[in-house]
Interface confidence: medium
């Protein structure tokens, strides 16, 4: 049988696994779709992205609201010409998440 | 031009994006490769998995050491025959990570 303390531990873990904005490491170049002769240093930044579990397999954790935050990064051209330049780069930051159907119910609508 | 304080902020962010064990939500059923007539509640647990950025595109963040931690979960059979039972489930927990080549340099060795 199981006691209330064990159930509390399980419930707390479940709450922590649920769909919510989580700090995630994203690669800037692939995020911005930049040309191959420009790259960023650091190549990655921390932002919040929706992640975690949904109760049903037919649902996926998706963002419902997004803000854009500015990160200061070095933009470097290859071959290296000027001293690396600090540029502000806007990256999507998920502020709200929800478990939503993987496809719209009425794809024809 | 950029001042040292700006660089410190960038440096701190970069440290946080680097390849290391990170708390991640994993789906137990796919982790264990369980049959479709058995599922777990909660369906997901939090464990540490390697994630983050590597300095070079040819490297990926991989685990170098792993421990197995036990999580108490309800194992449910479909169709439901008995009261859901609390079972200990062992899940891989990455304790060390490193940026390693995506493929060995000498595949023939």
């Amino acid at each position: 049988f199981y006691d209330i303390e064990t159930l509390k531990v399980i419930d707390e873990e479940w709450q922590r696994t649920q769909c919510s904005p989580r700090e995630t490491c994203v690669e800037v170049a692939s995020e911005l779709g930049k040309s191959t002769n420009t790259f960023f240093k650091p190549p990655c930044v921390n932002v919040f992205r929706c992640g975690g579990c949904c109760n049903e397999e037919s649902l996926i954790c998706m963002n419902t609201s997004t803000s854009y935050i500015s990160k200061q990064l070095f933009e470097i051209s290859v071959p290296l010409t000027s001293v690396p330049e600090l540029v502000p780069v806007k990256v999507a930051n998920h502020t709200g998440c929800k478990c939503l159907p993987t496809a719209p119910r009425h794809p024809y609508s | 031009f950029y001042d040292i304080e700006t660089l410190k902020v960038i440096d701190e962010e970069w440290q946080r994006t680097q390849c290391s064990p990170r708390e991640t939500c994993v789906e137990v059923a796919s982790e264990l490769g369980k049959s479709t007539n058995t599922f777990f509640k909660p369906p997901c647990v939090n464990v540490f998995r390697c994630g983050g950025c590597c300095n070079e595109e040819s490297l990926i963040c991989m685990n170098t050491s792993t421990s197995y931690i036990s999580k108490q979960l309800f194992e449910i059979s479909v169709p439901l025959t008995s009261v859901p039972e609390l079972v200990p489930v062992k899940v891989a927990n990455h304790t060390g990570c490193k940026c390693l080549p995506t493929a060995p340099r000498h595949p023939y060795s």
Epitope: P79, T81, S82 | F1, D11
Partner: antibody
Framework: QVTLKESGPALVKPTQTLTLTCTFS??????????VGWIRQPPGKALEWLAN???????YYNPVLRSRLTISKDTSKNQVVLTMTNMDPVDTATYYC?????????WGQGTLVTVSS | DIVMTQTPLSLPVTPGEPASISCRSS???????????LHWYLQKPGQSPQLLIY???NRFSGVPDRFSGSGSGTDFTLKISRVEAEDVGVYFC?????????FGGGTKVEIK
């Protein structure tokens, strides 16, 4: 407060190797995006960029002098070392250490190196 | 290499009067990222160069507003609206758009 100080021999004989050390404070070369470089100025003449080294140990050299120059760093000591081989009297100059930002904001006081037999 | 040509070589000035220095590059200094990395330094007698203007027209912190920079492409100008005695020294233009980063030959500003 950022400071950089050059040290090395004041006099070098032709064909010898010059070794200069830049000791800096107020920043760390392990900090992301940081660089240290060397610029020289012959007496009464223009400035000439020589080399620089980045936090990741990437190195860039003036192509004209590349074969004679080596730059290295000791992050724990806050030092950058420049070596220049096969010195010639035309290499007589004041050698400056700079913190590499775009543009160069912080410069050392410079050290005069004379090449003479 | 990008050649930076400064004129005049020497500039005798009267305190309170304006002064202008020209800098011409052998190639455009517009970087592929759109910025123009043309900077001006002043080297006072017996001192290291100090930054005055960066990226054509931006005054560095602490630089008096009598100093201004302008220009584009290959032609650039440093202006001093009213020269003061403390402005004497050698003025250098510099480009960091292309490697190797290069400097002009310098313009010596002295009081008449």
């Amino acid at each position: 407060q950022v400071t950089l100080k050059e040290s090395g021999p004041a006099l070098v004989k032709p064909t010898q190797t010059l070794t200069l050390t830049c000791t800096f404070s107020g920043f760390s070369l392990s900090t992301y995006g940081m660089g240290v470089g060397w610029i020289r100025q012959p007496p009464g003449k223009a400035l000439e960029w020589l080399a620089n080294i980045w936090w990741e140990d990437d190195k860039y050299y003036n192509p004209v002098l590349r074969s004679r120059l080596t730059i290295s760093k000791d992050t724990s000591k806050n030092q950058v070392v420049l070596t220049m081989t096969n010195m010639d009297p035309v290499d007589t100059a004041t050698y400056y250490c700079v913190q590499v930002t775009n543009p160069f904001v912080f410069w050392g006081q410079g050290t005069l190196v004379t090449v003479s037999s | 290499d990008i050649v930076m040509t400064q004129t005049p070589l020497s500039l005798p000035v009267t305190p309170g009067e304006p002064a202008s220095i020209s800098c011409r590059s052998s190639q455009s200094l517009v970087h592929i990222n759109g910025n123009t990395y043309l900077h001006w330094y002043l080297q006072k007698p017996g001192q290291s160069p100090q930054l005055l203007i960066y990226k054509v027209s931006n005054r560095f912190s602490g630089v008096p507003d009598r100093f201004s920079g302008s220009g584009s492409g290959t032609d650039f100008t440093l202006k001093i609206s009213r020269v003061e005695a403390e402005d004497v020294g050698v003025y250098f233009c510099s480009q960091s758009t292309h490697v190797p980063w290069t400097f002009g030959g310098g313009t010596k500003v002295e009081i008449k």
